[in-house]
């Protein structure tokens, strides 16, 4: 006999489900974005659900395969690349990550005119990174730390280096500190507009402090994985920058760009290059105490052969209150003039603003205003410059797409996307075609993700490139639980958060509360942003409420509150999520005695510092990856908010900001480490000092180690991660299993 | 049709003060760049200083910073040139001129007076 | 402070001829250079902005050119109502200041 316990109401809510954990794992919920590949003013590719290249025409409207997926599927190319005279495509397999953004894979190149792989003077393998040229089909790649040019598929490559060596030359793409810190590229080589000339940066690491972990594999002994790493205070490395005509490589060879004298005179950093013809090139250069950047503009002189940098083309951007830039120094988008430009930088309030730079930075015109803050510039053309911002409504979580009209006086602005989606987009980004003749705008929330083909004249909608119908539909017998954000005033500052609370959430009963916190200098956590991830499951079903706040430090509000944390890492953050779980409190649905805290990487270095606080406030935490001591962090990222470890500078605060100085007050609240062993970003070696500490201290706590994990701790380890992390904090709140 | 129209010079002895006017008709005064330019007997043309369409930026010629004041009055579509501590070699003839917008932020002097004459003696 | 430098000072011509007169910047202007007549007793009056756009109305045997810091107007097959003065102004950074003048006379 089946007893069933009667229905009390057959309505559509009982029909719906919670959130599972497996759900989350296996990504049941994700959605789906559309970049068009734009090659041209009206043309862009795209990757059909069946993996073939296919070419779309807005104005014909018409599409066709330009590359089909058998094609794809005989090389097993998981990416391509067309180039600019649409005559080749390379196809890119046996993808192999090494870092966030480096990988090596294999090469194919193939000739679209005949059909057939391009033979004889094959690509060597594997590459650390390969590009067309901008126009016709000039390949440059880097191989083995030294770059090669070849001027057409077939053709035999030249080599315009020869000193690469693995971890001590790197030409053409970055080292460890680079790519992680300053480009946040797996590049670091630049084609002229028209392919005349190719710029790269040569990183000489040889003097560079080795950090060395192992790697246990399957073999009898481990590998050690060694990597040139600056931590704070080390030897950086040593960077210059070349150019090479690719017409006549071999005529002059390449040309080193000079470095501005005032940059020179100590150590330094280069930061970015922009072509802005095919004669003049942009530098930006940085102090290696970064409040002092330099914008160096220099031109090719026809008569020696070299790049020439007057002084007068040197722009100076300097912080007096904390560092130069927000996360990076921001770069310049060139008006057609070819020597003004518009950039983001911070205005005399202390909100960061385009601004239009002609002859010096200080007869700058200020183009944005307001208690808000430009966020990026996307396109500039003869009468419109494109960005993003977080004016709208006063959000500063929020991103919406403007256009001004700067081909009149005066200028007028106008919202391309505050009102189009109200409810479901509030978070905006966009990718221009050639001349912002079209563009598509992607939508990443709060509502489920939308992406939309616009005309770059009159913003008209011309349609839908991916609107998550399958994501929609499978949402709709799902109990989500409920966002909101708001603001909480607190001694002049703001702290935005936002709350998820569980389906059926009644402000008269008591919840337990988890803080996820990040917090680290220039991020923003407190996004209108869509998301079914781990907290949602969190609040869904095991009833937990979440909340997310953004403190001092974080980014676009300002720099009062973005430099408040200048070389004080490790305050005032963690101040902020203190303040911010008693106004909780105080709102009378958070049981007190079921608060946890925690973070990944910079979060899990807040939520253990919360965690040592001594408040007594949390019952529990939980830190992945953190970091201990800002000693064992690199270089670029630490310095740039801390300073040098010195005695004559800051180090006084580094040894005052470490986890293990506080090792005595985690022993009243029960903490889970947990850490990757091959965390080539924030070394293991941070959480095994914390554990360290903790032992010598003889505090109990829980860990887990990620064998051969990196800082991402991927695949079966997330599973692996989010189930334990789950178990340990229903533990903490005395929630059933 | 653009009209500009400059007022106020005259006989001023040296160590004095002056304020010239200039008059706009014919467009939208409000939005353009407006300058001052003079022009001594029998010589080539100087660039007194320049007002933004706000009045929030001024710029002049270094040597007549401290005692040339440039300021706009939109609601009355007037320019102002206020002269002080005058001296001998500030006899010209005053022009003012206001143009078009040129992208990027740019402006040229498309329009000019007919220009007042200031002289400056004892 | 960027200094103009006009040449010639002055220059006779016949009607029909082709003359140049060349303007110097003491530093790169980049193009943002313009040229004006004068003609006696008048007000001056704008021929071309960016070194070498014409203003509406000029005349197309008007042409600017040059880069840099050297910069050029060239009056092709001058006809009577050309005499006068002629003044290159640069817009690049306040002040912006004029050139000297090419008077140019009927020969």
């Known amino acids: 006999i089946v007893l069933r316990p009667p229905r009390v109401h057959n309505s559509e809510e009982n029909t719906m489900r919670a959130l599972t954990l497996k759900d989350i794992l296996n990504g049941t919920f994700s959605y789906k974005t559309f970049f068009p590949n734009w090659i041209s003013g009206q043309e862009y590719l795209h990757q059909s659900a069946d993996n073939n290249i296919v070419l779309y025409n807005i104005e014909t409207g018409q599409s066709y395969t330009i590359l089909s997926n058998r094609t794809m599927k005989s090389v097993n190319a998981s990416n391509y690349g067309l180039s600019p005279d649409r005559q080749f495509v390379y196809l890119e397999s046996d993808y192999s990550k090494l870092w966030r953004y480096s990988y090596t894979a294999t090469y194919y190149i193939y000739d679209l005119s005949n059909g057939e792989f391009v033979r004889g003077n094959e690509l060597p393998r594997p590459i650390q990174y390969l590009c067309w040229s901008p126009v016709g089909s000039k390949l440059a790649y880097v191989y083995q730390n030294n770059i090669y040019l070849k001027q057409r598929p077939g053709d035999p490559p030249f080599q315009i280096t020869f000193n690469g060596r693995e971890n001590k030359i790197f030409n053409g793409i970055p080292d460890w500190v680079y790519e992680e810190e300053m480009l946040a590229t797996k590049y670091a080589l630049w084609w002229s507009p028209n392919g005349k000339f190719l710029a790269y940066a040569e990183f000489n690491d040889t003097d560079i402090p080795v950090i060395a972990y192992s790697y246990y594999g399957d073999e009898q002994y481990p590998r050690t994985i060694n990597i040139p790493y600056p931590k704070a205070g080390a030897k950086n490395p040593f960077v210059r920058i070349f150019i090479i005509d690719t017409t006549y490589p071999a005529y002059v060879g390449p040309q080193e760009v000079p470095v501005p004298a005032m940059i020179a005179s100590s150590d330094y950093y280069f930061s970015w290059l922009t072509w802005v013809t095919d004669e003049r090139v942009c530098l930006q250069w940085l102090k290696r105490v970064q409040n002092v950047s330099v914008l160096s503009i220099c031109d090719f002189r026809e008569d020696w052969q070299t790049w020439d940098c007057p002084k007068t083309q040197e722009h100076i951007e300097e912080s007096r209150t904390g560092w130069a830039g927000g996360f990076f120094v921001s770069t310049p988008v060139f008006s057609y003039d070819a020597i003004s430009y518009y950039k983001i930088f911070s205005d005399k309030d202390g909100y960061k603003h385009i601004h239009y730079i002609k002859d010096t930075v200080e007869n700058a015109i200020q183009i944005t205003s307001g208690k808000w803050e430009a966020i990026n510039i996307f396109r500039v053309t003869q009468d419109s410059l494109f960005y993003s911002s977080n004016e709208f409504e006063d959000y500063p979580g929020r991103r919406n797409i403007y256009r001004i009209s700067i081909g009149s006086y005066p200028p007028s602005k106008k919202c391309v996307t505050c009102h189009l989606r109200k409810e479901r987009c509030q978070y905006y980004t966009a990718s221009f075609s050639d001349y912002a003749k079209y563009y598509a705008l992607v939508c990443y929330g709060p509502g489920i993700p939308i992406s939309t083909l616009h005309d770059g004249r009159t913003d008209q909608e011309i349609k839908i490139l991916e609107e998550n119908k399958e994501l929609e539909n499978a949402l709709k017998n799902i109990q989500l639980p409920k966002e909101e954000i708001k603001k909480l005033e607190v001694d002049e500052i703001t702290l935005w958060y936002k709350m998820i609370l569980p389906p059926q959430f009644d402000r008269s009963k008591k919840y337990p509360l988890l803080i996820q916190v990040y917090g680290g200098p220039c991020s923003q956590s407190v996004r209108s942003v869509f998301a079914v991830n781990w907290i949602s499951y969190l609040a869904s079903k095991e009833g937990m409420v979440i909340a997310l706040v953004d403190g001092r430090g974080t980014a676009f509000q300002g720099d009062k509150l973005l430099y408040a944390v200048y070389r004080k890492l490790g305050v005032y953050e963690v101040e902020d999520q203190i303040t911010a779980v008693r106004k909780f409190i105080e709102m009378g649905f958070i049981d007190e005695k079921r608060i946890a805290i925690w973070g990944w990487s910079y979060g899990g270095y807040v939520s253990s510092l919360a965690l040592a606080s001594g408040t007594g406030l949390f019952k529990c935490g939980i830190a992945v990856a953190p970091v201990s001591s800002w000693e064992y962090y690199a270089s670029v990222y630490t310095e740039r908010f801390m300073g040098l470890p010195t005695k004559d500078d800051n180090l006084e605060h580094y040894k005052n900001s470490t986890v293990m100085a506080r090792a005595e007050y985690f022993r009243n609240v029960d903490y889970l480490l947990i850490h990757g062993t091959a965390d080539d970003n924030v070394h293991f070696q941070n959480s095994a000092q914390i554990a360290k500490a903790l032992v010598n201290a003889q505090v109990d706590f829980q860990a887990m180690w990620y064998s051969d994990q990196n800082h991402g701790l991927s695949g079966l380890s997330t599973n692996h991660l989010y189930t334990h992390m789950t178990h340990f904090l229903k533990q903490c709140f005395s929630l059933s299993d | 049709e653009v009209q500009l129209l400059e007022s106020g010079g005259g006989l001023v002895q040296p160590g004095g003060s002056l304020k010239l006017s200039c008059a706009a008709s014919?467009?939208?005064?409000?939005?353009?760049?407006m300058s001052w330019v003079r022009q001594a007997p029998g010589k080539g043309l100087e660039w007194i200083g320049e007002?933004?369409?706000?009045?929030?930026?001024?710029n002049y010629t270094p040597s007549l910073k401290d005692k040339f004041i440039i300021s706009r009055d939109n609601a009355k579509n007037t320019l102002y040139l206020q002269m002080t501590k005058v001296r001998s070699e500030d006899t010209a003839l005053y022009y003012c001129?206001?143009?078009?917008?040129?992208?990027?932020?740019?402006?040229?002097?498309?329009?000019w007076g007919q220009g007042t004459t200031v002289t400056v003696s004892s | 402070e960027l200094q103009m430098t006009q040449s010639p000072a002055s220059l006779s011509a016949s009607v029909g001829e082709t003359v140049t007169i060349t303007c110097r910047a003491s530093?790169?202007?980049?193009?943002?250079l313009a040229w004006y007549q004068q003609k006696q007793g008048k007000s001056p009056q704008l021929l071309v902005y960016?070194?070498?756009t014409l203003a509406d109305g000029v005349p197309s045997r008007f042409s600017g050119s040059g880069s840099g810091t050297q910069y050029s107007l060239k009056i092709n097959s001058l006809q009577p109502e050309d005499f006068g003065s002629y003044y290159c102004?640069?817009?690049?950074?306040?002040?912006?200041?004029f050139g000297g003048g090419t008077k140019l006379e009927i020969k």
């Open positions: 001129a206001g143009g078009y917008y040129r992208y990027p932020y740019y402006y040229t002097m498309d329009y």
């Open positions: 014919g467009f939208d005064f409000s939005t353009y760049w």
């Open positions: 007002i933004n369409p706000d009045s929030s930026t001024v």
């Open positions: 530093g790169n202007i980049h193009n943002y």
């Open positions: 960016n070194a070498k």
């Open positions: 102004q640069h817009f690049w950074s306040t002040p912006y200041t």
